[in-house]
Every structure is written in C-alpha cells, then in structure tokens.
Amino acid sequence: VPDKTVRWCAVSEHEATKCQSFRDHMKSVIPSDGPSVACVKKASYLDCIRAIAANEADAVTLDAGLVYDAYLAPNNLKPVVAEFYGSKEDPQTFYYAVAVVKKDSGFQMNQLRGKKSCHTGLGRSAGWNIPIGLLYCDLPEPRKPLEKAVANFFSGSCAPCADGTDFPQLCQLCPGCGCSTLNQYFGYSGAFKCLKDGAGDVAFVKHSTIFENLANKADRDQYELLCLDNTRKPVDEYKDCHLAQVPSHTVVARSMGGKEDLIWELLNQAQEHFGKDKSKEFQLFSSPHGKDLLFKDSAHGFLKVPPRMDAKMYLGYEYVTAIRNLREGTCPEAPTDECKPVKWCALSHHERLKCDEWSVNSVGKIECVSAETTEDCIAKIMNGEADAMSLDGGFVYIAGKCGLVPVLAENYNKSDNCEDTPEAGYFAIAVVKKSASDLTWDNLKGKKSCHTAVGRTAGWNIPMGLLYNKINHCRFDEFFSEGCAPGSKKDSSLCKLCMGSGLNLCEPNNKEGYYGYTGAFRCLVEKGDVAFVKHQTVPQNTGGKNPDPWAKNLNEKDYELLCLDGTRKPVEEYANCHLARAPNHAVVTRKDKEACVHKILRQQQHLFGSNVTDCSGNFCLFRSETKDLLFRDDTVCLAKLHDRNTYEKYLGEEYVKAVGNLRKCSTSSLLEACTFRRP
C-alpha cells in the first residue's frame, strides 16, 4: 500500500460498497501522486478503533461516545477532522446538551431530586447519558442497576425505550415507554412536549430543540436553561449554560504516526469534488443504500481539528466527566458540600518545589501538578487534571477563550481593604539603558529585544500590539535583529539571545534564565537593547534588592523608559511614560471549581500571605526571591473580583480588543484549539 493511502474502515456491507465507490471516484479526480483511499471492512466500530490502533486501518468516523472509547488506552486515537452542519459561513460542529425548564418553576440543577424528568430516550446522549452521567454521584445508592437509581432519584419520568415492567417509574409520564415516534414523548421534540404539556418539570434535550419546536420568541421566553453552576439562563444563552458541548461526528486517527495531514488532504479534496451539491455521480454525504454511511447524510462538509486538540479537550470536561461516571461508576467518598484539595498547576521544577512546600504547609488542602508551559497548565485545568493557577492577563485571555474563569486577582499595592478592592492594573513599560541615549520608541527596528514570554501582557501583547499597528505584519522576528521571547519557535531570531541550555533554550518557564519579568530585565542588562516588562521590575531588581550576582550591583538610575511620543523618562515616571495599563495577574479555574478555589485560596492567604513577616523561617505564598514562582513576588493579597468574574469583564474591553487584533499573529496552538470549540 503506497504511503499516501488512507485506509478507511467500514462497518457494514453497505459502508464497504460506498467506500469502494469513494475510492474509485477519488482516483478519477486526484492526480496519481495525491492521496488515495483503500477500504478495510470490520464488524463493528470498536473493531475499527482497534484496527486503527494496530495500524491495520487509518480512519473512521465516530459519534462522540465512540470518540471517547477511541481515546482510551490502549487505543489512544485522536480527533483529526470534524463534520460540520449548517452553512459554510456558520459551520456547526458541536451541539449542546441542555436541561430545559419552565420559567416559573424556581428550582436549580442541584435541586432536581424529586422532580419529574423528560428524556429523549434511554441510552441517548443529550437525553440520558449526559444528564444522568453528570448527576451520577447524586443518585441514591446502590447506583446499579442505573435505571433503578434514576427512578428513585426523580419522582417520575418518561424515558422512552426503558423497561416499563422492571422500572415503571421511568414510564410514569409516558405509559409504555414506547421506543418510536408512536410515543408522543419520544425523541427531542417528544421530550420537550413532555415538559410543555406539564407532564415533566425538566426536559433533557439539544440546544436547538426549543427553537425547532417554538418559532415564536415570546413562547420561548416561557422557558429557561438550568446551568451547572446552579443558576438559570435564557434559552438562547445555551453556549454559556449547558450540560455538555458534544461533537456531532468526527474522524479519528492514531495519535502518533496517524497520517492526520494526509487524511485532511484527502477529505478536503473529497469535499471539493463530491461534497454538498458538487457531483451527481457520487455524493460524499448521501447514502442511497442505507443511512449515514461513512459520514452523516446531514453533514455539509469537513473542518480540520486543530493539532493541539486531543480527545479530552475535543469532547470537553463535562462530557468526559459524564461518560466516565457512567462507565466507571466511581464517586468520591467525601460529602459533596466539602471542598476537595485544589490541584495547583506548577511550571517546571522551580515552581513545583515551591508548590510542594505549599502543599505540605497547607496540610493537603493544596496538591501540585506539573506542566512544562503555561498553555499545558491551562489544558490540564480544562480537562480536570489540575484546578487552578495564577496567570498573566495574556493567558487569562487564552484561558477565558478555553472556558476557564478568573476567580481572584493579585493586588500589588498595600491598602487597608486589599482583599475587597481589585486594582485597576499595572503599567507595561519599555526599558532601555541610559547609556543608549539615541534609542527611542520610534527607532527600535533592528535592535535587540527582551520579552517576558510570547503571549504575556507587558512582555508581548501590549508592545507587539502597538508595533503591529505600526508595521501591519506579524514578522516581529524580522523587525528586531534578535531577541529573547520565550515561547518563540526555536529557530526564530527571537530565541537567539536566550540563555537556557539545550532543550531549555527559549522555553516559556523558569528553566530559561531570561523568562519572566526578572529574566527579561536580565536579558537587557546582559545582552539586549530594550526590555518589555512591568513598571515595578527595575526597582525590584536594582539597589541590591535582588542578591543574584548579575543584579546585586545594578542602579535604577542607569535605566530609562521609552515613551510612546518618542521621548524618554526616568524609571520612576512610569505613570506618564508607559505603553499601556495591564490587567493584574489573576487566578483562573473551571466554573465548577470556582467556589472551592475561592474559599481555599482565601484561607491559604490568611495563613501564608503578606501577614507572615519572617519568610526565612516560615512559608510565604507570595515570595520567591524575585523569581515570581506561582504568584508575582510583589503580590500583597488576592482580591475578590466582585462582578468582574468573566475574562472579558476582568480584562476590560480595551485589552480584549487589543489581544483580539493580535490574534492574527498568534502562534498559540491552544487558542486555536479553543476557538475551534467556541469560535
């Protein structure tokens, strides 16, 4: 089999026939050096998954539940291409599983016990697996058989396809539990009708169900959605209030050596030639000899799944939690109203050591998880491997796009009411050596630059955003002659000045000596012409305040700031000479952990915060001798956000817009993956 062949896995005679037709028609339109199709027939989707894992086949299209199976060891498959529905301009690759209730019913998600429930059907995704999976640990024990536990949880249900003899309560609202449209409460529309008629209190359906059944907005306004954080939202806010976001139909491949680029090349060409309304003789999204053969008949095309996206990220935390609960049937022993330990994400070994020390001192209230980059940490928080970390504003933006929420803000100024008063922000500045007297904001081209890291606020987003507005392109590595911007591509000129050894060179963590505020300033001191840092960086590292050999003899007076009007000012005049105001660093977490992270961190800062005077003999949460480990070292306290509790509200319209403009220059694979899930 030539290397450019994609071995498609078919699960029935009809699929195999369509696959052969697909193969033959692709041959007729694609040059001989292009991708080709071969067909492999297996008895079931699980057999296909195993065949792909064993390198006997390359690709198959699966529903969400099977994508989960495909991801589990030892299969380790990943999503590579998604089918989309709707239009090319507004492609839908996901649907949302929602819980719909009547507006005046007055209960929340955590008060469903004893209510009457309407389901699309037993074992179906939005109508059963997701809601019951998420409610699993609230079900009365024993939880097996599941139907009995569900019957005892709700006071009555309609769950079409359930066994009405063994579990009559599941058929109480629809006698007989018929498994077809003969049952008026069967399927999406049926489950909604069950709620509408007043038979049930809650219907578990798809986000589109209510729109398909109620054309009139006034009618829709009589309903609300139950959110997982025990609030309610209008039915059109399903993107912010759902049980899970579920991919419709996805092509999977091996994680390693999986031919993902070849599969995309093949399917992209296939949709060009044989997609919707393209060809009479062969149609990719049509099944004359059956239904949904190889691909869904309702699909309109394909989209490439971003490479950073593994199955866990693609399926989403809520969906994975629901399915794992159903499959594994394990629940924590701790009472659910008690906070579990917060798993803090630490970057590389320096932060890990400080985190471990915190963990010991917290007596297990804090646990530690390691990752090599900030984006890896954000991904771990998304999928539940970690719970929280403190982030620079640029990463608060990425975390927000990935569905995380800010929960507390670092405050840097001493005040009587520190914890109740989140600050307006700090200043992003451009620092130069006083001796380089000809250097201004207007003649930085060809100079050597020092950045905290790619994607961070003061070190990248603000200066590069301003620069982009001037030069109108993203080739910052051509604008500066060389520099150190940790997180850049290793062969970029923006890694040339970095000092990390071997694989640590230019890494966006403390293994790279020029990483972060202190690192960028050190880069200026030792090699660079300009450093993009925060307004406190110079005073914090001069006048003997940083005992490290490179810093101990530095004098603040030897440095100046570049102002946007082309002038220069002394370092202490940052208020009148800065690039922009930057939002303070903030702690982020998943929505479901928000309350516990808030509670535990407030306890922790009372024990180990700025009130601790002797850090040589006691653990201090906000100290790490200028290394900014876990938190910035100048943090005075972690402050409540009040109503600034979304990333947009926290960062502010101006900053969100600035980072949004810079998105075209973004190299963030995580941001690409998260905007795929939520454009």
Epitope: H349, H350, L353, K354, E357, V360, N361, V363, S616, G617, N618, F619, S624, E625, K627, L629
Partner: nanobody, 117 residues
C-alpha cells in the same frame, strides 16, 4: 547553607520496613519545612512526605498510612519510617530543606531503597 546527608536505605522484601535518616550539618531548627522526595528510574522526582517546623505533616496519597515523617530538631535530623513497603516504593530517596528551592535543582546523593523478593 545547611548540608543534608541521607542514609538508611537498602534492600528489603515486600511488606518489610526501613527507617531513613537525613542529618543536617547546620541547625534545622530555624528551617520551616523539611521533606522527603523519591525518584524511580525514568520517572519524575515526587514528593513523598513533608513536615513543617511545628510538626504538621503531609503525605503523598500512595504512602499515606504506611510512611511516617518526623523531625528531631535537637539532633538536626529528619526521619522517614517506611512500613508495608511495596515494589513500587523502589527509588532513590532524597531529603530537602527547601532553602535552595528558588535557585537550582540542588540535591544530595540520596539513599537507594529497593523492595524486591
């Protein structure tokens, strides 16, 4: 800078016990947190147990109920009593005083613990 020397490792059968010691060349009294770490071949170094200056202890989930950390400030020594040892406890065990945490990975020689029948 306090110098730390680990000892007490050895070969032991599953279910057996060992007591590791970590002797400090300077006073550990003023040091807040002391901890034992371990590193198995091809794995990351991981925290096993820690003890604060006031004697508060914390353990990794995998050793809870089997290992006990203690400190004797007068003798400038930290101990790790390991009972019910399992083959997966095989590793080099290190102790740290966290005082060097912000500079580099600066560890002693460690002491090898091998659990095998």
């Amino acid at each position: 800078q306090v110098q730390l020397v680990e000892s007490g490792g050895g070969l032991v059968q599953p279910g057996g016990s060992l007591r590791l010691s970590c002797a400090a060349s300077g006073s550990i009294f003023s040091i807040n947190t002391m901890a034992w770490y371990r590193q198995a071949p091809g794995k990351q170094r991981e925290l096993v147990a820690g003890i604060t200056r006031s004697g508060t202890t914390n353990y990794a989930g995998s050793v809870k109920g089997r290992f006990t950390i203690s400190r004797d400030n007068a003798k400038n020594t930290v101990y790790l009593q390991m009972n019910g040892l399992k083959p997966e406890d095989t590793a080099v065990y290190y102790c740290t005083d966290y005082s060097r945490r912000y500079y580099q990975d600066d560890w002693g020689q460690g002491t090898q613990v091998t659990v095998s029948s």
